[in-house]
């Protein structure tokens, strides 16, 4: 049986935290790190659809970023494999109501953290 901390939501052996507050991309990742988590890594269409369903009407940062002229990478350093399109010309990715887009790192948005669930 999988379990997640209070205020976290479980889906397919992962736990997700949807923020109430807004922060820039860097501060959002710092928060996730403080919870032994990272900004969300989206590994399947099912996971993407789950996040889109649960995030509500606000944009939410996820754990994808890129250096200028470089490919998108997840927080753990693995390259993004183009599972879904990312619109926009920003360096950090977020989820909107239809999918993923990108914006400058200093803009403030809600965020989603993810980590492996706890098996009990």
């Amino acid at each position: 049986q999988a379990a997640c901390p209070e205020s976290w939501i479980g889906f397919q052996r992962k736990c997700f935290y949807f923020s109430d507050d807004t922060k820039n991309w860097t501060s959002s990742q710092r928060f996730c790190d403080s919870q032994d988590a990272d900004l969300a890594q989206v590994e399947s269409f099912q996971e993407l659809n789950f996040l889109l369903r649960y995030k509500g009407p606000s944009d939410h940062w996820i754990g994808l970023s890129r250096e200028q002229g470089q490919p998108w990478k997840w927080i753990n350093g693995t390259e993004w494999t183009r599972q879904f399109p990312i619109l926009g010309a920003g360096e950090c990715a977020y989820l909107n109501d239809k999918g993923a887009s990108s914006a400058r790192h200093y803009t403030e948005r809600k965020w989603i953290c993810s980590k492996s669930d706890i098996h009990v």
Epitope: L87, G88, D97, R104
Partner: antibody, heavy 121, light 107 residues
Amino acid sequence: QVQLQQSGPGLVKPSQSLSLTCAISGDSVSSNSAAWNWIRQSPSRGLEWLGRTYYRSKWYNDYAVSVKSRITIKPDTSKNQFSLQLNSVTPEDTAVYYCTRLANSDGVDVWGQGTMVTVSS
Amino acid sequence: ETTLTQSPGTLSLSPGERATLSCRASQSVSSNSLAWYQQKPGQAPRLLIYGASSRASGIPDRFNGSGSGTDFTLTINRLEPEDFAVYYCQQYGNSQTFGQGTRLEIK
């Protein structure tokens, strides 16, 4: 179709609290594909979003920075409605107040009839 | 907070003409979260366009939205007498903000 019916007083004294209610028919306040908002309109400030409540496995509230310290929006699942409370009002809070539905990614598609609220002694 | 600036403030045209209304955002807005509304005196705003370019239910096809990033446009082809009103743009991706409005009046 979805309809929103507003109720509440049209006159409030300065420093008191403004309270309005919005009754929902044709949808649920607990819907996981909608958010329920309060928006106001005045000649001086134009259309101004005040805040919203919505349910996604738990209840969330988002408030505009301009009113964050004195606003509360609450859902009432038993009556399928949501309410606005704005504390410490001043004449600058005089406006037409609207309750609205934001339907997932489809914009603010349903508006209440509007309530003209005057703040005056 | 994203600021939306609409231009022109007032647009004077005749029925049958084309109206082009502009909305510029202070920072990039997700195209999925940009809407246009029409408001007539004494009425609540009415949703015309959502997702920058999708027409709301019951909206005639002479109303068209376009744009992305920071620049968005509402075009009304073949103006009808009932189209003369005030038009607002709105972003709803990160809280919500409205433009100050464009008044479309009969020339």
